[in-house]
Interface confidence: low
């Protein structure tokens, strides 16, 4: 008799990450009979939705359906038709929508309502769209990277399956940078978490974890830039803002109405004698760094120690995975190598920011000018945030690993979110049955 290939017994899940600057759709796949094993879920597709984040559709909600079409159709192609009806779809919106909700709960609800109606039209098992909290974003990012690094597995391996694995069960901390918020999450060493808002307790695979997390709203790279501009224009003598965070020779006109559109700049808002101002780049890393530091209030701390703005932060502990914009920006700047010291990163940033804009445009001809113009600011901001905000030092810098993907899956909150919502991370260690791992050879 002829051997017939048995149909693959797999499951799929879809998570849409509705971020402040864009939306991405992730498709995950796993063997159906191994749902409770650690490390079996992997990403098979990422589809970046063309256009801005969903919060920008507040005045044009009728366009949301078309906006989501391409990536949802891509999911239809990737996932076998027979699996469509049982494939869960989740949409989580992050800080861009948190900010919109701060401005108007009604407008945020309207956007989510249209998103839900659009996603319900597809043949998948739509499970809802919601704005996740900053704590969830931090927690799920932490779960994702540690799941992918095999940190929840009780079996210690004699070989390393991922580049960052140190072959111990010590979890990695998670550093996530988005456009509108940034999250820091890790297991402190025998330290009381002095602020209950920042304390998470998990029981995963039979082990208890006491995790610290905080999400700094308005301190994602895009909102931090708006904050810096709003702060600096207060002291400008006219409608010219000479800005050290942009390359020499760079010029851009900014509408004051756009500057004050976000809740993140409210604390700097003032009546200006002009409707527009012009940014003129002067490209000076040191001055840019100084200007950024003024966004962090370190003068007040009601705890034993703080990050900034009075937010408790325990002493840093262990290795950290830095992902999302931490990775994208540092990758562009060619600074993700484990061998590059903090001093070297600073030196490279000084040189990069000082390069004339015309020269930069020529060197990176394929990169959109909007993004290209902001790498000096973003790189400097990342250094300021990690060093002054989170208190990394030149020595502890080597414990930061800039991570894009782990074993083919993007580092970020989406995988952890799906694992949680599909109950694929058991509280207790699953009992392994004979031959249950025979396919791991």
């Amino acid at each position: 008799t002829q051997n017939k290939a048995l149909p693959e017994n797999v499951k799929y899940g879809i998570v849409l990450d509705a971020g402040s600057s864009h939306t991405s759709l992730y498709i995950y796949k796993w063997p159906a009979e191994k749902e409770n094993d650690t490390g079996v879920v992997h990403q098979v597709e990422e589809c970046r939705v063309k256009g801005p984040g969903i919060s920008k559709f507040v005045q044009k909600v009728n366009e949301i359906g078309i906006y989501l079409t391409d990536c949802m159709e891509r999911a239809r192609e990737v996932i076998p038709r027979s699996q469509h009806q049982e494939t869960p779809v989740y949409l989580g919106a992050t800080a861009g929508m948190r900010l919109l909700r701060m401005e108007s709960e009604e407008l945020a609800d309207r956007v989510l309502d249209v998103v839900e109606r659009s996603l319900s039209n597809y043949p998948f098992d739509f499970q809802g769209a919601r704005i996740i909290t900053g704590q969830e974003e931090g927690a799920y990012g932490w779960i994702t990277i540690n799941y992918l690094l095999g940190k929840f597995s009780q079996k210690t391996r004699w070989f390393s399956i991922v580049p960052y694995e140190t072959n111990n069960q010590e979890t990695f901390g998670a550093l996530d940078l988005g456009g509108a918020s940034t999250q820091v999450t890790f297991v402190p060493q025998n330290q009381t978490i002095e602020s209950p808002d920042n304390a998470l307790q998990f029981r995963l695979y039979g082990k208890d974890y006491n995790v610290y997390t905080h999400s700094f709203l308005c301190y994602g790279k895009d909102q931090a830039l708006w904050q810096k501009l709003a702060k600096d224009i207060q002291v400008a003598s006219n409608e010219i803002l000479r800005d050290p965070c942009f390359h020499p020779g760079y010029k851009k006109v900014v509408n004051v109405s756009d500057l004050y559109k976000t809740p993140c700049t409210k604390r700097f808002e003032m009546t200006l004698p002009f409707q527009q101002f012009e940014i003129q780049g002067i490209g000076n890393y040191q001055q840019c760094h100084q200007s950024i530091l003024e966004l962090f209030n370190t003068s007040y701390c009601p705890y034993s120690q703080c990050a900034f703005n009075g937010i408790f932060l325990p002493p840093l502990q262990g290795d950290f995975g830095a992902f999302s914009a931490f990775y994208f920006v540092m990758k562009f700047l060619n600074l993700t190598s484990e061998k590059v010291s903090q001093e070297k990163v600073t030196e490279m940033m000084k040189k990069f920011c000082a390069q004339p804009w015309e020269e930069i445009k020529t060197s990176y001809a394929g990169v959109k000018e909007k993004y290209l113009s902001e790498y000096c600011f973003s790189g400097t901001y990342i250094l300021s945030l990690l060093l002054q905000g989170y208190h990394f030092t030149a020595d502890s810098w080597e414990h930061i690993h800039f991570i894009g993907k782990i074993q083919g899956s993007d580092a970020g909150w989406t995988l952890g979110y799906m694992l949680n919502l599909t109950n694929m991370i058991p509280a207790e260690q699953p009992l392994s049955t004979p031959l249950s791992h025979s396919t791991y050879v």
């Epitope: 996740i132 704590q135 602020s195 209950p196 808002d197 304390a199 307790q201 998990f202 009601p302 949680n420």
Partner: antibody
Framework: EQQLVESGGGLVQPGGSLRLSCAVS????????ISWVRQAPGKGLEYIAI???????YYASWAKGRVTISKDSSKNTVYLQMGSLRAEDMAVYFC??????????????WGPGTLVTVSS | DYQMTQSPSTLSASVGDRVTITCQAS??????LAWYQQKPGKRPKLLIY???SLASGVPSRFSGSGSGTEFTLTISSLQPDDFATYYC????????????FGGGTKVEIK
């Protein structure tokens, strides 16, 4: 409108058991912690248990083993299962919403309460 | 355990008086303290969270202060609607919720 409504209270005999429900609307249980608090007639507020947004549970020491807090996010309901009831358990039982993980920013939203009477 | 001790247990005052209620924690709870108002037969109402932040919709005559182990609730000018029982609550530890609330302070008409 965001609200919590308790139900399941009533008369129960000593030694009996009871399951109280707290139905929430206008917000998601995956974003907030829910606490149960009770108040005996003429007495102060007494914490019973809390379930955070991740499903982690904590109990007052007197409640451990006698009380179970749980939630069904699909039904938007938190439960308080109570056993071995005694006369001193007679009280109004409130459920209240904290932040994601507990009550670090206070319990900002309370249900109207449900009365549990323990008597033979 | 975090023992919360409130004083006084009863306080007689007149409309327009400045009223102060104190709450002491047996251990350092940093600024993780909330104050509630409760009227007979009603649910408690959050007044102050994180020791000094005014909850939404609460009149500005209510204020909170303190951190660590000593906390104060002040009503700057007592109004007829303010006669009620007030409770403090530690929001620091979820693991130790036995004595999370203070015993209460009843503010009655003098």
């Amino acid at each position: 409108e965001q609200q919590l409504v308790e139900s399941g209270g009533g008369l129960v005999q000593p030694g009996g058991s009871l399951r109280l429900s707290c139905a929430v609307s206008g917000f998601s249980l995956s974003s907030y912690a829910i606490s149960w608090v009770r108040q005996a007639p003429g007495k102060g507020l007494e914490y019973i248990a809390i379930i955070n947004s991740y499903g982690t549970t904590y109990y007052a020491s007197w409640a451990k083993g006698r009380v179970t807090i749980s939630k069904d996010s699909s039904k938007n309901t938190v439960y308080l299962q109570m056993g071995s009831l005694r006369a001193e358990d007679m009280a109004v039982y409130f459920c209240a919403r904290g932040d994601s993980y507990g009550s670090g920013v206070g319990l900002g939203l309370w249900g109207p309460g449900t009365l549990v009477t323990v008597s033979s | 355990d975090y023992q919360m001790t409130q004083s006084p247990s009863t306080l007689s005052a007149s409309v327009g008086d400045r009223v102060t209620i104190t709450c002491q924690a047996s251990q350092n709870i940093y600024s993780n303290l909330a104050w509630y108002q409760q009227k007979p037969g009603k649910r408690p109402k959050l007044l102050i969270y994180r020791a000094s932040s005014l909850a939404s919709g609460v009149p500005s005559r209510f204020s909170g202060s303190g951190s660590g182990t000593e906390f104060t609730l002040t009503i700057s000018s007592l109004q007829p609607d303010d006669f009620a029982t007030y409770y403090c609550q530690q929001g620091f530890s979820s693991n130790n919720v036995d004595n999370t609330f203070g015993g209460g302070t009843k503010v009655e008409i003098k």
